[in-house]
Amino acid sequence: EDELQVIQPEKSVSVAAGESATLRCAMTSLIPVGPIMWFRGAGAGRELIYNQKEGHFPRVTTVSELTKRNNLDFSISISNITPADAGTYYCVKFRKGSPDDVEFKSGAGTELSVRAKPS
């Protein structure tokens, strides 16, 4: 059986300030069981953008219904984009663990750039 892959099809996305940005991510398998998270940045200081399991992310919506039984689409949309949102976003799969989930695989990242709001 092939190991799960995390696919972020776009290397980069450009969005005008004030618009929403869609960041696409898909899994190739339902296994292993565990949540996905979106981060900005790849280092120790990476910022949590969305956690499937818990948390409050008022500007983030999921593109598809993540609780659907066979869902493999973990794309998100971030509303009201500002220049401060620029950066590289990573979709990361975690394997369910006890007590803590363990990072399993990361997508290659999507760089979000923000254009000036059209006048």
């Epitope: 940045g41 120790a44 990476r46």
Partner: antibody, heavy 117, light 108 residues
Amino acid sequence: DVQLVESGGGLVRPGESLRLSCAASGFTFTNYAVTWVRQAPGEGLEWVSLISVTGTTYYADSVKGRFTISRDNSKSTLYLQMNGLRAEDTAVYYCAKVTWKNVFDYWGLGTLVTVSS
Amino acid sequence: EIVLTQSPGTLSVSPGERATFSCRASQTVGSKLAWYQQKPGQAPRLLIYDANTRATGIPARFSGSRSGTEFTLTISSLQSEDFAVYYCQQHTDWPPYTFGGGTKVEIK
């Protein structure tokens, strides 16, 4: 406004323990890594420890095995448990918020730890 | 561990003059270098990251540049509030996050 307030510093003897706290407000604590940086009297800055958003911990070699960083997301509070304290641990301890660029954009005012017999 | 060496240790400058000081990394850090300002009795304040990007609210008189592993912070026209100690920090993806020893900018 982002605020970080450290507490728990004080005077202890070598070998003793102390637990520092850092209460955070003004940002979504769960979404950011947080860190401790210290400054010995009249000296420069020294990075001590960092805890990521997923709870992964990192330490400077000088404190590894003696200090433990932790976070309580429900209380928006960062901790530093310091055991086996030495005279060279005497410093002002600052907590700071970490950006995704791995820089420290907001700092507390610090709490002084003095280790002396 | 990456060692950052700042020079000079102390810089004496008159208000209104230009101040330039440097930070050299012992190995490559790309552009992952930040600058902080610290005044007596205060916490450090982030000025510059990624070698030349000003942090939010930092005046345009502060600028950073890079040439290989040598980084420079320039204050184009020193104001009274700029007299302080300046530290560089490498901010590559993974710890340890080392700081330089600092440069004290004092009034001439």
